[in-house]
């Protein structure tokens, strides 16, 4: 508890739960300072005008902080970049522009899998190190935001929709839409 925001060494504020920033504007060179693409396109979708949707995964590296405390070691995780789109139309970095089906459903690239890691926090003033458990984003996926649910419900994209995921805690749909931060769990 108390991890409202993470701050890395470039003073980039990674919002706490409940705060979802808009992705940075499209740039031909970088997005979130991660470059050279992500994983190859995935999640085929059977649609009349779109053969495949792609979800860009960018990685980044940072130290986690909690107030004056800082992780003893840095971590690496993925950033799920913004809007999904047909793979054949995607630029190097996904912007907010919709190039197809303006009246169609809204697709978002959001965290899919997380990996739990334990990190040690070092605090100034001789305070004892603290151990925390974090959930780092391990993969991203496209989810469809339906207009039939007041734009609030994210649905799994592709064949996974009808398959319940065993052994995983349910994640509120609204939480994942733009969140790309490590999620902390109480680990005392």
């Amino acid at each position: 508890q108390g991890w409202q925001a993470f701050r890395n060494d470039a003073t980039e504020v990674i919002p706490g739960l409940g705060e979802y920033p808009e992705p940075p504007p499209e740039n031909n060179q970088t997005m979130n300072r991660a470059e050279n693409g992500g994983r190859p396109p995935h999640h085929p979708y059977d649609a009349k005008d779109v053969s495949e949707y792609s979800c860009r995964e960018l990685h980044y590296t940072r130290f986690l902080t909690d107030g004056p405390c800082r992780s003893a070691k840095p971590v690496t995780e993925l950033v799920c970049s913004g809007q999904c789109g047909p793979a054949r139309l995607l630029p190097n970095a996904i912007g907010r522009v919709k190039w197809w089906r303006p009246n169609g459903p809204d697709f978002r690239c959001i965290p899919d899998r997380y990996r739990a890691q334990r990190v040690q926090l070092l605090c100034p003033g001789g305070a004892a190190p603290r151990s925390r458990k974090v959930r780092l984003v391990a993969s991203c996926k496209c989810k469809r935001l339906t207009r039939f649910h007041n734009q609030s419900e994210l649905k799994d994209f592709g064949p996974e929709t009808a398959r319940p995921q065993k052994g995983r805690k349910p994640r509120p749909g609204a939480r994942g839409a733009k969140a790309n931060q490590a999620e902390l769990e109480n680990a005392y």
Epitope: T76, R118, L136
Partner: nanobody, 117 residues
Framework: EVQLVESGGGLVQAGGSLRLTCAAS????????IGWFRQAPGKQREVVAS???????YYEDSGKGRFTISRDNAKNRVYLQMNSLRPEDTAVYYC???????????WGQGTQVTVSS
């Protein structure tokens, strides 16, 4: 278990270039994310750049446009090409390895880079 050894550090004049090498031993090297970090005297260790097994790169603002990270999985090596060096780049440079979506748990011993004005 992956082990890392840095090399290529040294003394260089401002505006000069250096190429650091991180050599790894271990069969699973290619699956790790490799990062370069640095620590100047009296300061905290900070991120410089990192690269995934697939070649996706990340740069902190301090080295953006001047530093280039690359890797050769066949040789188990990761490189940091540093151009237009400045005195404030003086530090011990470390490479470290992390599993994807993980903590950088494996560290090299570091190589000293000194940039004189």
């Amino acid at each position: 278990e992956v082990q890392l050894v840095e090399s290529g550090g040294g003394l260089v004049q401002a505006g000069g270039s250096l190429r650091l090498t991180c050599a790894a031993s271990g069969r699973t090297f290619s699956s790790f994310v490799i990062g370069w970090f640095r620590q100047a005297p009296g300061k905290q260790r900070e991120v410089v750049a990192s690269i995934t097994s697939g070649g996706s790169t990340y740069y902190e603002d301090s080295g953006k446009g001047r530093f280039t990270i690359s890797r050769d999985n066949a040789k188990n090596r990761v490189y940091l090409q540093m151009n237009s060096l400045r005195p404030e780049d003086t530090a011990v440079y470390y490479c470290a390895a992390a599993e994807p979506a993980g903590v950088y748990d494996v560290w090299g011993q570091g190589t000293q880079v000194t940039v004189s004005s």
